[in-house]
């Protein structure tokens, strides 16, 4: 289907391929292979959903996600003395978010300019590979973090070097797995020139031949193996965690821990409901419809779901906040435009001068660099 009788190919609901080069003539462009999309697809590619809504969301994700994940990675690498497994998983989560978010200015420009990709084939492949890589990395590291949180409640043993090494090993295995499963996204030609719209799309229009069966099988496999199975593990870990916390003794400290655990569970649940479930479900439905009907009627929903999946880069910092004392302190102080060092100095001076209760309670509310995992 890549090359029809007349060496031409058609897209179906943003699917299809021009297999060949194009060259500019006096007026317009002459393409060696005909490529056309259906009218609905064309309306999506030229409509406000992709040219206004998407860039707005991606701008928010970039503006929030870049500094918060950047700070998180810095805190976990350089400001956390004990590298607990949770810290290791969160550092990887932050790294995955950063690797995806750094490409967003190109993605924003692409959508603002009417879904016209001008940055070349290689950059498009990198952007798409990192886009999906981030989503599946986030799911897997979130699963590891969730299982680890439950493990800490069941076995509240001290930090051991062995546990940290296991966490590092698991993290490396996850990166390797994601690299392997996203290889098809790097290998496949992702850019395509659509003569009717005079635009070159990146990933929005894909080779028909590939899509009919392969894309459906690919995303179905990912949805089962890298979404459903980890989601089941995460849910199980949190259900067991809630049971454990309910049955445990209720002193002031454990009540605080319980509240934070519930906040963490709600955050992760929100992430699954907003980011991971809609995108994975619609990826499968979208490609199933293309496979069976030749066009997808859920394209608009699919595009919104994929867009919302990037919000995980904004939600992840809340996870860090509820899990890590160090990140919590740095986040609070960053928002109050203070450094932890300044707060420590304030604390020392306030303690030595034996200030009023109000002052000391104020200073203590935003300090402490101790960690409890």
């Amino acid at each position: 289907t890549i090359q029809g009788t007349n060496r031409s190919s058609k897209g179906r609901s943003l699917i299809g391929k021009v297999d060949g080069t194009s060259h500019v003539t006096g007026k317009g462009v002459t393409v060696e292979t005909v490529f056309s999309v259906d009218e609905f697809s064309a309306s999506v590619l030229t409509g406000k959903l992709t040219t206004v809504f998407l860039p707005i969301v991606y701008t928010i994700v970039f503006v929030v996600g870049l500094p918060s994940n950047g700070m998180a990675l810095w805190v976990f690498l350089f400001r956390t003395k004990k590298k607990h497994p949770a810290v290791i998983y969160m550092a990887n989560l932050a790294l995955a978010d950063l690797l995806s978010v750094i490409w967003f200015p190109l993605k924003i420009a692409y959508h603002i300019h009417g879904n016209n990709w001008i940055y070349g084939e290689a950059l498009c492949n990198v952007l798409i590979g990192f886009f999906y890589g981030n989503m599946y990395c986030s799911i897997l590291f979130m699963t590891c973090l969730s299982v680890q949180r439950y493990w800490v409640i069941v076995n509240p043993m001290g930090h051991s070097r062995k546990k940290a090494n296991i966490a590092i090993g698991i993290s490396l295995a996850i990166w390797l797995l994601i690299l392997l499963v996203t290889i098809p996204l790097y290998v496949v030609k992702q850019t395509i020139f659509i003569p009717a719209l005079n635009i070159t799309t990146c990933h929005d229009v894909l080779p028909e031949q590939l899509l009919v069966g392969d894309m459906f099988n690919y995303f179905l496999s990912l949805a089962i193996g890298v979404f459903l199975f980890p989601a089941f593990l995460t849910a199980s870990a949190y259900v067991l965690m809630i049971r454990m916390l309910r049955s445990s003794a209720m002193d002031e400290n454990s009540e605080k821990k319980r509240k934070r655990a519930i906040k963490l569970i709600v955050t992760v649940l929100a992430m699954y409901l907003i980011c991971f479930t809609p995108s994975n479900l619609l990826l499968v439905v979208h490609y199933f419809l293309i496979k069976s009907q030749g066009q997808s009627h859920v394209y608009a929903l699919y595009i919104v779901a994929l867009c919302l999946s990037t919000l995980n880069s904004c939600i992840d910092p809340f996870v860090y906040y509820f899990v890590s004392h160090d990140f919590r302190d740095h986040a609070k102080n960053a928002l109050l435009c203070r450094s932890v060092r300044t707060v420590k100095q304030m604390q020392v001076s306030l303690t030595s001068k034996k200030h009023s209760r109000k002052s000391s309670s104020y200073s203590s509310s935003s300090t402490t660099v101790k960690t409890s995992y």
Partner: antibody, heavy 119, light 106 residues
């Protein structure tokens, strides 16, 4: 109403260039594409090429090296130029209107012009 | 490359007859098949597009069905003015025409 009309020489010498014009009315060439199709005597139809509403063009792979499609939107005319004609290029040549999208058919066609390649 | 096989090549029927013309694609073309009517010395005329959608001004006796690889044009009650050559066109991947069916009156 929508109308397309092909015009050009009925007889062309082998190795010469064929020039055909498709004059349209009832629609804008900026909004619609125009396709060229030919039908050799007693044979089936063959798609030749297309010019989109934005001026982009594409050609049948087998004719690509000999074919050029252009247009003049102000005159509502589309032109087909094919060089190095051979006797097997003898056919009825049609132009048709196309919206430019995959799910649209060639909804209106011209009457066609018979071109004979002979010395 | 998608090949379109149209059958029969010739068809003779009487006025009032139910006539069916078939078109078979070499691979799945989903719904992207159109039917055209061409009378001698006239421009081809669109009858049915996207398998079963009737073009404006076309009598309701013409109908289309099928999906995937097998498609059918049906004339429920043949009229004298329906004498013509009918051909199918796939536009799922490029454009390929069927060989045509010449319909005449008995």
């Amino acid at each position: 109403q929508v109308q397309l009309k092909e015009s050009g020489p009925g007889l062309v010498q082998p190795s010469q260039t064929l020039s055909l014009t498709c004059s349209v009315s009832g629609f804008s060439l900026s909004s619609y594409g125009v396709i060229w199709v030919r039908q050799p005597p007693g044979k089936g139809l063959e798609w030749m090429g297309v010019v989109w509403g934005n001026g982009n063009t594409a050609y049948n792979f087998t004719l690509k090296s000999r074919l050029t499609i252009s247009r003049d939107t102000s005159k509502s005319q589309v032109f087909l130029k094919m060089n190095n004609l051979q006797t097997e290029d003898t056919a009825m040549y049609f132009c048709g209107r196309w919206r430019g999208f995959k799910d649209y058919p060639f909804d209106y066609w011209g009457q066609g012009v018979m071109v004979t390649v002979s010395s | 490359d998608i090949q379109m096989t149209q059958s029969p090549s010739f068809l003779s029927a009487s006025v009032g007859d139910r006539v069916t013309i078939n078109c078979k694609a070499s691979q799945n073309i989903y719904k992207y098949l159109d039917w055209y009517q061409q009378k001698l010395g006239e421009a081809p005329k669109l009858l049915i597009y996207n398998t079963n959608s009737l073009h404006t001004g076309i009598p309701s006796r013409f109908s289309g069905s099928g999906s995937g690889t097998d498609f059918t044009l049906t004339i429920s009650s043949l009229q004298p003015e329906d004498v013509a050559t009918y051909f199918c066109l796939q536009h799922n991947s490029g454009w390929t025409f069927g060989g045509g069916t010449k319909l005449e009156l008995k």
